[in-house]
Amino acid sequence: QGWQAFKNDATEIIPELGEYPEPPPELENNKTMNRAENGGRPPHHPFETKDVSEYSCRELHFTRYVTDGPCRSAKPVTELVCSGQCGPARLLPNAIGRGKWWRPSGPDFRCIPDRYRAQRVQLLCPGGEAPRARKVRLVASCKCKRLTRFHNQSELKDFGTEAARPQKGRKPRPRARSAKANQAELENAY
């Protein structure tokens, strides 16, 4: 009866088609998903620049079910996973289709969550248990963070650490898409 097939850590991932899936098309809605638009012109001297905004990183879209104990979301949610090495925006594979990976020998930049959004989810539970409603935090956009020698590897693995905690998508930045729009997006996608 239960959801034995699903992990109990809210991380069951359903990869989308393709190696680097495209985000779903934007809906006719004034509340649009934050995207990391921190690309722009690559620096003239990439290793000397202090402007992290000149660097860009990939946002991979994943669709997954949210779980809470034995309960599982009625519908999957789409979220971002921040992926890969940061490099000048023009040299990233998702900026130029045939671009090569740019491997920096200078400062270490990592792709980490920048902002998050909250999305309402309804969780269905086995055994006749009442459904639950929760709000889940999802990564809304990614950013390149310049790591100094004082940052250790554990900070990269654990998004709960200071270097890598997602921030909220605040005005005047682009607003996170509303829960209603996300629901519509998921319904359209499936």
Epitope: R117, R120, R173
Partner: antibody, heavy 121, light 109 residues
Amino acid sequence: EVQLVQSGAEVKKPGASVKVSCKVSGYTLTELSMHWVRQAPGKGLEWMGGFDPEDGETIYAQKFQGRVTMTEDTSTDTAYMELSSLRSEDTAVYYCATDTVGYWEKFFQHWGQGTLVTVSS
Amino acid sequence: QAVVTQEPSLTVSPGGTVTLTCGSSTGTVTIDHYPYWFQQKPGQAPRTLISDTDDKHSWTPARFSGSLLGGKAALTLSGAQPEDEAEYYCLLDYGGRFVFGGGTKLTVL
């Protein structure tokens, strides 16, 4: 652990404005959803407004719309609540409250100690 | 704006059980109102007991539980202790705008 420290008590005249501050430590302000709640002497709690991470913007209770402004100084991790055109019925303890940084979004988990604002001529 | 209603006062004997309720002027309270319950003692800031209908916090004593009951949100206290004497507030989420109930003064005697 999130900690919130609010500014001290204020005495204001009717028609004036008051700006209450709430300093965040333990996390950065941009990681949190800050809300403001007030409580008149001997009365119940009243939600004034706060940051909505679904829409990415600050929203206000209808009652205070146009009279309250909630701002943040991310360089000092301090949130502010400014209430204008004060009247005697605005005499209350004003609380800031935030969510918890975690997988689930839970509001009002951490509270400031409260700031008493007295409006009197 | 919606009005959220609570019993103004309730009394429970030590060791007894009591249920506080939280209704909405807009109709039935559902899980989509994400009901919160707060406890406040005199001279103190409120503290959250329950979020999202039934979700307890690490500091919430096991004797408190949240649920939906007869179209309202409910907070049940089983095995009341003298220290549970306090004001209890519920809070409902109306699409990102929150409304507190008037509060229930709980007396343990």
